[in-house]
């Protein structure tokens, strides 16, 4: 499907050097494309600002855990 082939890829070239409070975070998405130079996380804040972060950093991993748990629903 040609549209998918030409879909734009979002990459992160620099990471925030500041820890962001989880209370300010609304969601995240991972950048896993091989077309990008770095493995990255993009956090979206509650005011819809997008911030690139380094997934190797513990605060980033803890923030992703926190956001994941907010999506949790009982499974049967």
């Amino acid at each position: 499907q040609p549209d998918a082939i030409n879909a734009p890829v979002t990459c992160c070239y620099n990471f925030t050097n500041r820890k962001i409070s989880v209370q300010r975070l609304a969601s995240y998405r991972r950048i896993t494309s091989s077309k990008c130079p770095k493995e990255a996380v993009i956090f979206k804040t509650i005011v819809a600002k997008e911030i690139c972060a380094d997934p190797k950093q513990k605060w980033v991993q803890d923030s992703m855990d926190h956001l994941d748990k907010q999506t949790q629903t009982p499974k049967t």
């Epitope: 969601s27 998405r29 991993q61 992703m64 855990d65 994941d68 748990k69 999506t71 949790q72 499974k75």
Partner: nanobody, 123 residues
């Protein structure tokens, strides 16, 4: 690109135990939520267990709760599923998955999957 390889499956009698392992390579293991799923013949793939990146939180499907335990060793890039008191209905192919996208137990939020390991529980 993360590669996942499961091991530890096999044939066991009802009431027995197995420990599945999933070794990861090619990415930052501690940055992925890890899950186990299973698929029995003629059935859809179903969620079994999930563990957070830190290992501090996990949850299970009701069908395995109290019998299965998920754990991880970030230093060894490995996630485990200890399965006790196995039942014939636990027979399935068990898949390890790495969750890159925001979510919890939904298969669609797991970007990377292993090839699976067969678990057969005889009565």
């Amino acid at each position: 690109e993360v590669q996942l390889v499961e091991s530890g499956g096999g044939l066991v009698q009802a009431g027995g135990s197995l420990r599945l392992s999933c070794a990861a390579s090619g990415g930052t293991f501690s940055s992925y939520r890890m899950g186990w799923f299973r698929q029995a013949p003629e059935k859809e793939r179903e969620f079994v267990a999930v563990i957070t990146r830190s290992g501090g939180s996990h949850s299970y499907s009701n069908s395995v709760k109290g019998r299965f335990t998920i754990s991880r060793d970030n230093a060894k890039n490995t996630v485990y599923l200890q399965m006790n008191s196995l039942k014939p209905e636990d027979t399935a192919v068990y898949y390890c998955a790495a969750g890159a996208q925001m979510g919890w137990a939904e298969a669609s939020t797991y970007d990377y999957w292993g090839q699976g390991t067969q678990v057969t529980v005889s009565s």
